[in-house]
Interface confidence: medium
């Protein structure tokens, strides 16, 4: 349905609130160096003018499009040039071609100071004194930081940061109330940014097609009990949600999620039995609780795929009739029935069925060819179960920390020319997956875990696409996006690596180091035994564990002395020294 | 009982236009999706269109895409299925029928009407 005023439908759709968040997270995501007092001002006179437009759909300006309206509102901006440098050539382009321009420009690794948490009575002090700032203030150090966030979800997260500032501020401890809230908003928010960083890049990289085979086999184990209709239904709508948060549509995509969430909880019979408790919550916590609802128990009744896919006669003539809608349905049927597998292993499975089927139905006996093409996933299958197997194993066996070593190690090994930092954060990042997934039960694990390294991959071919490095990593990243993690398992030693030369100064430390948080203390230790990697790419990993032992015996001694920082300057010497010889 | 009566079909030349409509009866209409199917002369039946019990989304089989548009009327309980571009391999009985539970088979369909496409 067409509307005079573009931005007057989503101001009066969304309300004032929703509608100056989303604006400020726009323009956030976009000009992500911006200070927050300028962008607040560029969103006051958009929401006026919005105003103007909802008062008189006929006022001048109001029948221009939203991305013309924005574009021409940060093309205003007066230090562009200074601060963006070439960004500030996409403001001679005209629309479509200035958002395309705008979006190519966002960085995924901004040169931001990380966030720092002040004291909890300057925090409450804050939000007790101007609440809307302060709400305002997260919304653009989130967005800023996380150019792709899923905008709507921000507002949810931003909803419970207000609520745990509201609770906290009017308890007895207000530390022990707001810390760990802060902390699960934190890493909830760390956790839901990467996973939507994945879904842009599958729809921008690989296409919409990618995208909706994903979210088929997403929904079908969700929704087991949902015909296939029905969750097609569900993945347009879901694709048109995505495509356009990831295109910087904020405002239609937030629009769009409440209609479809309006849509889910008016037709919760056809869907999934789970929905009911998502839908007697508001807006925001809603649209989050379908997003995040468990799967739907099965039908008792599934029969055997084989008769439809394998030894019915029309296999080949459905196919040839609609592709898609035939692999479409196959891949609902494996998926409803597979809430064990990994949705990257269930699309593999439909890539190999569709593999078959084009060589087969080409064949001068299709069903002779195809008849043993399910015999022919069973590698497919085992390969992820065998992976996650040894993995937990190696987690229960080492712990967090020690199983993220093993990890640093293994991908320094992999992909050596990847930036210290990047590898220290990929594969601190993927030594979580235990915690997260070695703990649930068996048919839980490789859903948990093959689909939780799909996102940390995708960080990792993000940042290297910013910066490329590595032919290895290119592959992995571009070649296909389900078999990223196949193809980053499969890496071997780099034997064309040419070692980096020793620089003590890397292993130079000092009195600092016995003041840091524990994390930071590992993330030191880390980018440490990365260096050594790099230096020593053939090192055994009984050479490495005693280099690292002797580190954290000289840190722990240098941090008890009285006079630390003279231990550090005499002992640090020796350590380096001594690892040459263990390495040499 | 589950009832589903197709119209609109004849004789038209290839280039033609065609309108077939399926007046739907004894179940909830709209909260079942619906698809048109057809069998040529001498052939097995053949997947044409599917729609959604909201109206989006649509399927076409490859062989009509871009020809063919299936839309539907809930508050009327009828299916409609508009044929552009006609050629003579479109010449068959089209039958409308609720889409199927499970897989590419349907639970029921009506009696058909011919569409014959000749010059």
């Known amino acids: 349905d067409t509307h005079k005023s573009e931005v007057a439908h989503r101001f009066k759709d969304l309300g004032e609130e929703h509608f100056k968040g989303l604006v400020l997270v726009a323009f956030s995501q976009y000009l992500q160096q911006c200070p927050f007092e300028e962008h607040v001002k560029l969103v006051n006179e958009v929401t006026e003018f919005a105003k103007t437009c909802v008062a008189d759909e006929s006022a001048e300006n109001c029948d221009k499009s939203l991305h013309t309206l924005f574009g021409d509102k940060l093309c205003t901006v007066a230090t562009l040039r200074e601060t963006y440098g070439e960004m500030a050539d996409c403001c001679a382009k005209q629309e479509p071609e200035r958002n395309e321009c705008f979006l190519q420009h966002k960085d995924d690794n901004p040169n931001l100071p990380p966030l720092v948490r002040p004291e909890v009575d300057v925090m409450c002090t804050a939000f007790h004194d101007n609440e809307a700032t302060f709400l305002k203030k997260y919304l653009y150090e989130v967005a800023r930081r996380h150019p792709y966030f899923y905008a709507p979800e921000l507002l949810f997260f931003a909803a419970r940061y207000k609520a745990a500032f509201a609770e906290c501020c009017q308890a007895a401890d207000k530390a022990a109330c707001l810390l760990p809230k802060l902390d699960e908003l934190r890493d909830e928010g760390k956790a839901s940014s990467a996973k939507q960083r994945l879904k842009c890049a599958s729809l921008q990289k690989f296409g919409d097609r990618a995208f909706k085979a994903w979210a088929v086999a997403r929904l079908s184990q969700k929704f087991p009990k949902a015909e296939f209709a029905e969750v097609s239904k569900l993945v347009t709508d879901l694709t048109k949600v995505h495509t356009e948060c990831c295109h910087g549509d904020l405002l239609e995509c937030a629009d769009d999620r409440a209609d479809l969430a309006k849509y889910m909880c008016e037709n919760q019979d056809s869907i999934s039995s789970k929905l009911k408790e998502c839908c007697d919550k508001p807006l925001l916590e809603k649209s989050h609780c379908l997003a995040e609802v468990e799967n739907d128990e099965m039908p008792a009744d599934l029969p055997s795929l084989a008769a439809d896919y394998v030894e019915s006669k029309d296999v080949c003539k459905n196919y040839a009739e609609a592709k898609d809608v035939f692999l479409g349905m196959f891949l609902y049927e494996y998926a409803r029935r597979h809430p064990d597998y990994s949705v990257m292993l269930l699309l593999r499975l439909a890539k190999a069925y569709e593999a078959t089927l084009e060589k087969c139905c080409a064949a001068a006996d299709p069903h002779e060819c195809y008849a043993k093409v399910f015999d022919e996933f069973q590698p497919l299958v085992e390969e992820p179960q065998n992976l996650v197997k040894q993995n937990c194993e190696l987690f229960e066996q080492l712990g967090e920390y020690k199983f993220q070593n093993a990890l640093l190690v293994r991908y320094t090994k992999k992909v050596p020319q990847v930036s210290t930092p990047t590898l220290v954060e990929v594969s601190r990042n993927l030594g979580k997956v235990g915690a997260k997934c070695c703990k649930l039960p068996e048919a839980k694990r490789m859903p948990c875990a093959e689909d939780y390294l799909s996102v940390v991959l995708n960080r990792l071919c993000v940042l290297h696409e910013k910066t490329p490095v590595s032919e290895k990593v290119t592959k992995c990243c571009t070649e296909s996006l389900v078999n990223r993690r196949p193809c980053f398992s499969a890496l071997e030693l780099d034997e064309a690596y040419v070692p980096k030369a020793f620089n003590a100064e890397t292993f130079t430390f000092h009195a600092d180091m016995c003041t840091l948080s524990e994390k930071e203390k590992q993330v030191k230790k880390q980018t440490a035994l990365v260096e050594l990697v790099k230096h020593k790419p053939k090192a055994t990993k009984e050479q490495l564990k005693g280099v690292m032992d002797n580190f954290a015996a000289f840190v722990e001694k240098c941090c008890k002395a009285d006079d630390k920082e003279a231990c550090f300057a005499e002992e640090g010497p020796k350590f380096v020294a001594a690892s040459q010889a263990a390495l040499a | 009982e589950v009832q589903l009566l197709e119209s609109g079909g004849g004789l038209v030349q290839p280039g033609g236009s065609l309108r077939l409509s399926c007046a739907a009866s004894g179940f909830t209409f709209d909260t079942s999706s619906m698809l048109w199917v057809r069998q040529a002369p001498g052939k097995g039946l053949e997947w044409v269109s599917v729609?959604?019990?909201?109206?989006?989304?649509?399927y076409y089989a490859d062989s009509v895409k871009g020809r063919f548009t299936i839309s539907r009327d809930n508050s009327k309980n009828t299916l409609y299925l508009q044929m552009n571009s006609l050629r003579a391999e479109d010449t068959a009985v089209y039958y409308c029928?609720?889409?199927?539970?499970?897989?590419?088979?349907?639970?029921?369909r009506g009696q058909g009407t011919l569409v014959t496409v000749s010059s």
């Open positions: 029928a609720k889409f199927p539970s499970r897989k590419m088979k349907f639970d029921y």
């Open positions: 729609i959604h019990q909201s109206g989006t989304p649509t």
